[in-house]
Interface confidence: medium
């Protein structure tokens, strides 16, 4: 599915994946374990969560979001190094909050260009854009503080507690449902 969120590929170069296995469909395998894993989605050009059964499957499976991004997104490590070395923020840091269209309630972080800080938001579990980080630290490292230096302080504590419903929440029904992938 095409996702166009004013998201240019200039920072991440060509959208051709780094390895052929990154183009494989997510494969949970035949076993029945419930292991949260990550795969590279060729259609959204993002690393996304899925539930791995614990056996078989394929190489497009990673234990962490970061590992998936490093392995499958062209130029990702270069972008991260560039950010850490004080160069400008990657383009995707300026994308607006996008919870996607699904109804999962995943706690994620995004860079808010208005406040110039990483903030918590609720991700629905599918689609969305690349301004979406699993940890506050990863968001800060890439988008908030690309020149390095230490974050910390009270703001981090308050930020970690702040959670608000945004577009993609359940405005009519107020049914709280949680996805585990």
């Amino acid at each position: 599915l095409s996702e166009e969120a004013d998201d240019t590929d200039s920072e991440l170069g060509s959208m051709k994946p780094l390895h052929t296995f990154c183009a494989m469909k997510a494969d949970d395998g035949p076993c029945k374990a419930m292991i949260r894993s990550y795969f590279f989605n060729m259609y959204t050009h993002q690393c996304e969560e899925f539930i791995y059964g614990g056996c078989e499957g394929n190489e497009n499976r990673f234990d962490t979001l970061e590992e998936c991004k490093k392995t499958c997104i062209p130029g990702y490590e270069k972008t991260a190094v560039k950010a850490a070395s004080g160069a400008e923020r990657p383009d995707f840091c300026f994308l607006e909050e996008d919870p996607g269209l699904c109804r999962g309630y995943m706690k994620r972080y995004l860079y808010n260009n208005q406040t110039k800080q990483c903030e918590r938001f609720v991700y629905g579990g599918c689609l969305g854009n690349r301004n979406n980080f699993e940890t506050l630290d990863e968001c800060k490292k890439i988008c908030e503080n690309p020149g390095g230096g230490s974050g910390g302080g009270l703001n981090d504590i308050f930020e970690a507690q702040k959670i608000e419903w945004h577009e993609g929440g359940p405005p009519h029904h107020h049914h709280h449902h949680h996805h585990h992938h």
Partner: antibody, heavy 118, light 113 residues
């Protein structure tokens, strides 16, 4: 009361263009993602495209990618679907719907018929 | 060919209980994505019947209930009434497709008598 009213359908030749509109009322339009879903005569439902509340993110089914463009004007409470390079297989009733419960479409318009034929 | 598979038709007598099945795969229902159900009465737009697997919007009678288990989902209608005659569609998200919001092919429910 939530109301969604589609317009702009009609008969068009293959290769031609049409722009559908969906006028929304009865809810805070800018707070909701919106979708277009179509139904070919006598067939099932097919999701076409969606757009986030602010309009910053758009999504398309493969069958229309590169030919259709979804947009919205929140000041006018209106959703649009610009359809170019139309094909016979695009013939359908086009519904606009609001993503009230995100992946669920809470409210639907009455639909507007698009016929692509020479 | 729809990503989610439904029986094309079902029938039941008034007062009976009918169940409409929706079978998916590990990339949609089996990946813990919600299923929704829509009712489409003849000549009208679809109407949301069940969202988030088993939740009814206000105004939908409790004769309608939904469930999801593994790669399958079902819609149960108890105390079948003449006005339930309609097409019913299941819908979910599929992470392996580019057209990610997916529907079943629809089930035409006929109320006998």
């Amino acid at each position: 009361e939530v109301q969604l009213v589609e317009s702009g359908g009609g008969l068009v030749q293959p290769g031609g263009s049409l722009r559908l509109s969906c006028a929304a009322s009865g809810f805070t339009f800018s707070s909701y993602a919106m979708s277009w879903v179509r139904q070919a005569p006598g067939k099932g439902l097919e999701w076409v495209s969606a757009i986030s509340g602010s309009g910053g993110s758009t999504y398309y089914a493969d069958s229309v990618k590169g030919r259709f463009t979804i947009s919205r004007d929140n000041s006018k409470n209106t959703l649009y679907l610009q359809m170019n390079s139309l094909r016979a297989e695009d013939t359908a009733v086009y519904y606009c719907a609001n993503n009230g419960a995100a992946a669920a479409w809470d409210y639907w318009g009455q639909g507007t018929l698009v016929t692509v034929s020479s | 060919q729809s990503v989610l598979t439904q029986p094309p038709s079902l029938s039941g007598a008034p007062g009976q209980r009918v169940t409409i099945s929706c079978t998916g795969s590990s990339s949609n229902l089996g990946a813990d994505y919600d299923v929704q159900w829509y009712q489409q009465l003849p000549g009208t737009a679809p109407k949301l019947l069940i969202f988030g697997n088993n939740n009814r919007p206000s105004g939908v009678p409790d004769r309608f209930s939904g469930s999801r288990s593994g790669t399958s989902a079902s819609l149960a209608i108890t105390g079948l009434q003449a006005e339930d005659e309609a097409n019913y569609y299941c819908q979910s998200y599929d992470r392996s497709l580019s057209g990610s919001m997916v529907f079943g092919g629809g089930t035409k429910l006929t109320v006998l008598g």
